[in-house]
Structure formats: C-alpha cells, structure tokens
C-alpha cells in the first residue's frame, strides 16, 4: 500500500518551487498534458548552450514525511537527444541529478541551504532511456522516463527533494512521492493493523476480529516488510467465538442465524438446531429446549432436548402368599433417551382403612428404584392389607421436569391369615374300628376358629379314592370304620374367616387288633 | 500570458521577398511549435510551416516548399518567416502562432495553437 | 497533403439552437484534430484540441468529437457570441492543413 505526500498530477494550482540561481534558461513551470489527456503542473529546463560548471537547481516544497522512514520518489520525465539539438554544444547532458534535504520545519530559502551536495544529500543521477527526437509527425513525441528512487533513511521532521541540472533539455512531467505501508490485513480472523516499516522487517501483533476469540498457542504476529508487503508466513490466529462462524473468506465471524448454533469456539460452522430445541436469536452458542424438553447436565450443548418418558403400561401382579411379582412393558414414549430406568412408590392399607407409605418390612428385588428390567419382587407382605404400587419411569431429564410424574398404578390386596397348622395331635381312644383324636386349639390370628377338618387314610394306600376328610366343630374327633390293627396317617388343619390353613404334619396312630383291650386312651 | 508580437505591414513588389517577424515575450521559446498561418482577404486559413526553434529546422506545407524558409533565434525569442517570388496572390495577414505545449510536456503533439500574434498585412502589388 | 473538408460552408442559425458542424478528412488522423473559431479583423482562437479536449477558459457548450476521418463540432446553445467563422485543423502529418471554413450566421 501506497500512502501519497505528494502528486503532481493532482495539483491544479501552480506548483511554485524554488529554483536556483535566478537566471535566463532557468527551470520554468510549465502547463503539461499528460497520456489520460489531463492537464498537469511541469517543469522545464533546456539550457543546452550553458557554461560549463552552471548549475540550475530546482527544489519542491517542504513534505512531511509522516513518519516513513523510507519514501519513494516516481518520476515522470522527458529529455531531448543532444544530438538531435544541431545547436548544442558538447556541455549537453542526457542526465540530471536528485537530492534531498531533512529539516524540522520549512526553514529553507532561496540560498539556505547552500545549493549543493552537503547539505544536500545525493539520491541518484538520473539518465533517460527514453530520448525525444523531432517528432516526424503528430504521434506520441516520445516515450515518457519513468524512475522510482528511494530516500532515506528519514528522521527529521519533513524533507525538501532537489533536482539539479547541467545542460539537459528536459521537462520533469510529474513527481510523486509516497511511503509503502503494509495494509491492514486480516487473515485467519486476525486483524494486523495498517504498519509503517521502520526497518527491514517489522514483527506485528495481530488482534482478534470480532466475536473471534485467541486460538491456543503464542499471540499471532506477522512481519511487515519495507516495501510495504506482509511476509508470507503461517498465522495460528483466532477462530470464532461460540454462537459465530467464520465468513468470508476467513476475514469476519459471521454470527449464527436463528435456528442454527455453534457451541464451541474453534472452527466449525453453524449447525441447525437438533431436535426439540430452537435458538430465537442470532449469534447462539446453544439452543433452548422447548417447554417440556430438557438437556440433562452431563448432556453435551449440541445433543437434542428430551423429555421424561410416559409411564409404563400394563402392569401385571402376581400374588404368592407374601410375595408379589411385578411385570410391566416399557413406556409407549420414551422420551428421546436411552437411559431408562424404573422406580416403584408403594403405599399399603390396614383392614381398618388406615392408610400409609410402606413400612421396611417390605424387601424389593433388585430394588425399588433404578431399576433396568421391567420387573421387581416384592416380599414380606401382610395379609389382609391392600399394597398400591405407583410403577414410574423415569431418564436422565426426569429430574429436570416439573410436575407430576406419570406412573402406572396396580393394586394388590393380600389374604386374610389362616389359622397356623395343627401339629400337637393325640389318641385318645382306640379300638379295632375306631380312633379318638385331640388336639390344641391354634391361635388363629384373624378371629376364632370356626371348625376343622380332619384328613386320614391308611399308610400305604395313597391313591386318592384312599384319603377321606372329617369336619368337626371341635377340636377332637373320631375316625370310625378302621381296619383292625391298622395304622393310620392323620393331618389336621383349622378354619377360620380367612379359611383354612395349612394341615399340620401327618400323626401316626394304630388301630387295636382285638376287642378285649377296649377302648384304651394313647397319648401321641 | 506569452505574447507574440508580429513586425508591421509591407507592400512588397511581385517576385519580391518578404521577411516578417515574430517575438516572444517571457517564458521558455526553444521547444515550442511556432506555426506561420496566413490569411489571404476573404478566405480561410492556410498553413504555411512550422519550426521547433531547439531543433532547428522547419517543416513546410508541399504548397510553399522551396519558397518559404521558416527561422528561429532563440537569444532573442524571435522566429521569421521569409516568402520569396512574390505573386499577388501571396497578399494576405500573415500570423505566428505558438502551441498550447511544448515538446517535452505533451505526450502527443497536438500542435493545437493558442497563442497568435496580431497578424501582419503583406500586399504584393506592382 | 491531407485534405480537409468542411460542410457546410455557411449556415444560419438563431440564439439557442444547437449547430452541428463537420470536418471530414481524405485520409486517417486518428484523434489529431483541432478546431478554432475567428470573428472578422481578429486572429484565430482554439477550442478544441485532440478532436474532444476543451481548451482552457472555453465555454462548455462547445464540444468536439470523432476519429479517424470524420469529426464534429457542437455548439449545445447558441449564443451571440458564437457567430463566426469555424476552422478544423488536422495536426497528423508533417504538413498541417485546415478546412475550408464554415461560417455561422445569424438567421
């Protein structure tokens, strides 16, 4: 990049330079057109005849240098072939001179400083490769010289640039004078500011663009070099931040549209929304769940929203005694998630109607809750009570939601308890025929003992057409129709409300093989 | 702003010769294109040559060739134009005019004139 | 020599209209072509140059276009000051030659 202090061929006012000494066949400024058809401020020697030594000296205004250390002189020049010019003497020259001054301020005048190399400071002698002859004609008069020079090092303040001739006829078409920059760049979204070079190569700090954010690693840097280029080299840069994408062509980050989301910072761009979820602003890093969907904590920001899963369906109860077996299907929804689990709430009902959560006495296999299977045993229920069981499904955003959880409820209600077994049987009487039993009254937990059945058969006929029963109100009986001299297996169970419970373990008892011994009491 | 100022009037015999002049006042002279154009009553305007005074010699319209010379002293700023073999026809205003540019500061030369001198009147009469 | 012809030779015009003036060369010129008006006992004066260029401090009115062999002279509005005698100059050989001339006058 070209940064301008002086143009010539934009000045539309008379230049008025200073030239030295004030005499005939001095530079004189001239109205110029130039190849666009422009009309541009020149300057004019041609002093072809002059004594020898005979300086002329033309010199620009004062320019501040604008802090270049460097600044570039382009020429534009046109110098006549001495040998064209049959009045020239030998003292003709094809060439002139450039210098410069430094100075803090325009303190220069028409014979300060002293007109000649130191102070002045040579640049170049220039030579034209481009000399005007007679034109043959009315096509171009001659190639126009151009010549870029380069001064410095600067350090003053501003500077005055020279030009001296010795016997040339020339016109000095224009002079632009410039510095070389680099220019603000930016690349892999960082931003290197516009630099002038101070020396051969300058290191630059680049800064982050916009919504971009530093990528790991050293600060990014370029070098800017003197002639006013960066120097190629890779740059760990920026990248966008979270909820922007890098656009064109790596020079901006762009924020998301709505509906789309980048998470994290980095390269990437932005994606649509995943499922349940939306982002009603631009530049969004996440996109919020709708209501009802949820991300659960250990979820990463891209993954889709979910919800609690609906409750399980058809649970079937499978009541043994005091345990119960529990079996359901899986939620028609399951939310989105794969982390299923079960749990189960239980609440039970005295016969009274007093109700209440479950006590401990109540064991769950595996468990009550994180359950993976569809399944659970419960144990240790008590008779004649009235279990609910609330069967939930629950995922990793059950927790999230508010309001109620759905459940599948089931209702169990156990047996009224039977009287326990009656074990402690005895003979009281016996006869060939005949067998009088007795036994202890049970303690029925659920009211009194209303009767007893008696079962009896032969040992060794165990065929059921063998086995018959007796009821009695009592707690004794007796077997009639025996075979003399038999033995007899008896088993004895009681009724209560509840109905009956379980026989007791068979008693062995014989019948007499003869009347003579009577009736005779047995104790068992 | 340059002025040309042209030498006065002459009355000159057929087959005579007539020398006018034309100074420049102020400024550079030598890369200009001084052009001597004349006039002859009622008519329209005629080129008759042009010189470059740094280069010395002229160019001349095929009509006047032989009989023209076109000349410059640049000590003096002065260019001349010179008609031999006067006819009658030759009575006619004289003007020098210079170009808009020089040599060295058009990049095409349009030989386009804007300064002229006031003209001056030869009448060629025996 | 290169011959220039001009057309037309005279015309009358009144303040305000737009005159049209043409130039026609025997041979290609490419861009060097000059106009220039004179008004009676003055010299010549440019005002154009390069067949388009306006000459400096010359009205805007005047404009100038063409190439090669034919060339036009424009006055976009007449004024009274613009009756005179119009030249085209061609600068492409050696040899310059003007046209004949046309004269405005007023109608």
């Known amino acids: 990049l070209e940064e301008t202090l002086l143009n010539t061929k934009l000045e539309t006012a008379d230049l008025k330079w200073v030239t030295f000494p004030q005499v005939d066949g001095q530079w004189e400024e001239l109205s110029g057109l130039d190849e666009e058809q422009h009309s541009v401020r020149t300057y004019e020697v041609c002093d072809v005849q002059r004594a020898p030594g005979q300086a002329h000296w033309l010199r620009t205004g004062w320019v501040p240098r604008r802090g270049a250390v460097h600044v570039y002189a382009t020429l534009r020049f046109t110098m006549l072939e001495c040998l064209s010019l049959p009045r020239a003497g030998r003292s003709c020259k094809e060439t002139f001179t450039v210098f410069y001054y430094e100075s803090d301020a325009d303190t220069a005048t028409a014979l300060t400083p002293a007109w000649m190399e130191n102070p002045y400071i040579k640049v170049d002698t220039v030579a034209a490769e481009h000399l005007t002859r007679k034109r043959p004609g009315a096509e171009a008069t001659g190639k126009v010289n151009v010549k870029t020079l380069r001064l410095g090092p600067l350090s003053k303040a501003g500077f005055y640039l020279a030009f001296q001739d010795q016997g040339a006829c020339m016109a000095l078409l224009s002079l632009h004078l410039f510095y070389k920059k680099c220019a603000q760049l930016t690349v892999n979204l960082t931003r290197f500011p516009e630099t002038v070079p101070r020396e051969l190569v300058v290191p630059v700090a680049g800064s982050c663009v916009v919504d971009a954010v530093p990528a790991p690693g050293p600060s990014p840097s370029l070098y800017c070099r003197e002639d006013g280029q960066w120097a190629e080299q890779p740059v760990t840069g920026c990248s966008c931040a979270p909820g922007f994408e890098a656009a064109e062509g790596n020079t901006k980050c762009r924020a998301c549209a709505q509906g789309t989301f980048k998470p994290l910072s980095g390269e990437g761009s932005c994606q649509p929304c995943p499922a349940n979820s939306h982002s009603n602003t631009i530049g969004s890093a996440v996109c919020q769940c709708r209501v009802g969907y949820f991300r659960a904590r250990t979820d990463p920001r891209g993954a889709p929203c979910t919800t609690p899963p609906s409750a399980p369906r058809s649970v079937v109860s499978r009541l043994n005694g005091s345990s119960l077996h529990l079996e359901w299907s899986a939620p028609l929804e399951s939310g989105g998630r794969e982390d299923l689990t079960y749990a189960l709430r239980c609440r039970e009902c005295r016969p009274g109607g007093s109700c209440a959560p479950c006590g401990g006495d109540l064991t769950f296999d595996p468990g009550p809750r994180d359950l993976v299977e569809p399944w659970v045993v419960v144990r240790g229920l008590r008779p004649d009570f009235t279990y609910t069981f609330e069967v939930t499904a629950l995922n990793g955003v059950s927790s999230l939601a508010t309001g109620p959880v759905p459940f599948e409820p089931v209702n169990v209600t156990t047996d009224r308890e039977v009287p326990p077994a009656v074990s402690d049987i005895r003979v009281t009487r016996s006869s060939p025929s005949s067998l009088s039993l007795a036994w202890a009254v049970p303690r029925a937990p659920s009211g009194a003992v209303l009767d007893y059945e008696v079962k009896y058969h032969e040992k060794g006929a165990e065929g059921p057409s063998s086995v018959r029963f007796l009821k009695t109100s009592e707690n004794r009986a007796e077997l009639r129709g025996l075979k003399r001299g038999a033995s007899y297996l008896v088993q004895v169970r009681a009724r209560s409300e509840a109905g009956y419970g379980p026989f007791g373990q068979e008693h062995h008892s014989q019948t007499q093989l003869d009347e003579s011994e009577g009736w005779r009491e047995q104790l068992a | 702003q340059v002025q040309l100022v042209q030498s006065g009037a002459e009355v000159k015999k057929p087959g005579s010769s007539v020398k006018v002049s034309c100074k420049a006042s102020g400024g550079t002279f030598s890369t200009y294109a001084i052009s001597w154009v004349r006039q002859a009553p009622g008519q329209g305007l005629e080129w008759m040559g042009e010189i470059i005074p740094i280069f010395g010699e002229a160019d001349y319209a095929q009509k006047f060739q032989g009989r023209v010379t076109i000349t410059a002293d640049e000590s003096t700023s002065t260019a001349y134009m010179e008609l031999s073999s006067l006819r009658s026809e030759d009575t006619a205003v004289y003007y020098c005019?210079?170009?808009?540019?020089?040599?060295?500061?058009?990049?095409?030369?349009?030989?386009?004139?804007?300064?002229w001198g006031q003209g001056t009147l030869v009448t060629v009469s025996s | 020599d290169i011959q220039m012809t001009q057309s037309p030779s005279s015309l009358s015009a009144s303040v305000g209209d737009r005159v049209t003036i043409t130039c026609r060369a025997s041979?290609?010129?490419?861009?060097?072509l000059n106009w220039y008006q004179q008004k009676p006992g003055k010299a010549p004066k440019l005002l154009i140059y390069g067949s388009s260029i306006l000459q400096s401090g010359v009205p805007s009115r005047f404009s100038g276009s063409g190439s090669g062999t034919d060339f036009t002279l424009t006055i976009s509005s007449l004024q009274p000051e613009d009756f005179a005698v119009y030249y085209c100059?061609?600068?492409?050989?050696?040899?310059?030659?003007f046209g004949q001339g046309t004269k405005v006058e007023i109608k």
């Open positions: 100059h061609q600068v492409s050989d050696t040899s310059d030659t």
């Open positions: 005019a210079r170009s808009s540019y020089t040599i060295l500061t058009t990049y095409y030369n349009y030989n386009a004139m804007d300064n």
């Open positions: 041979q290609n010129i490419n861009n060097f």
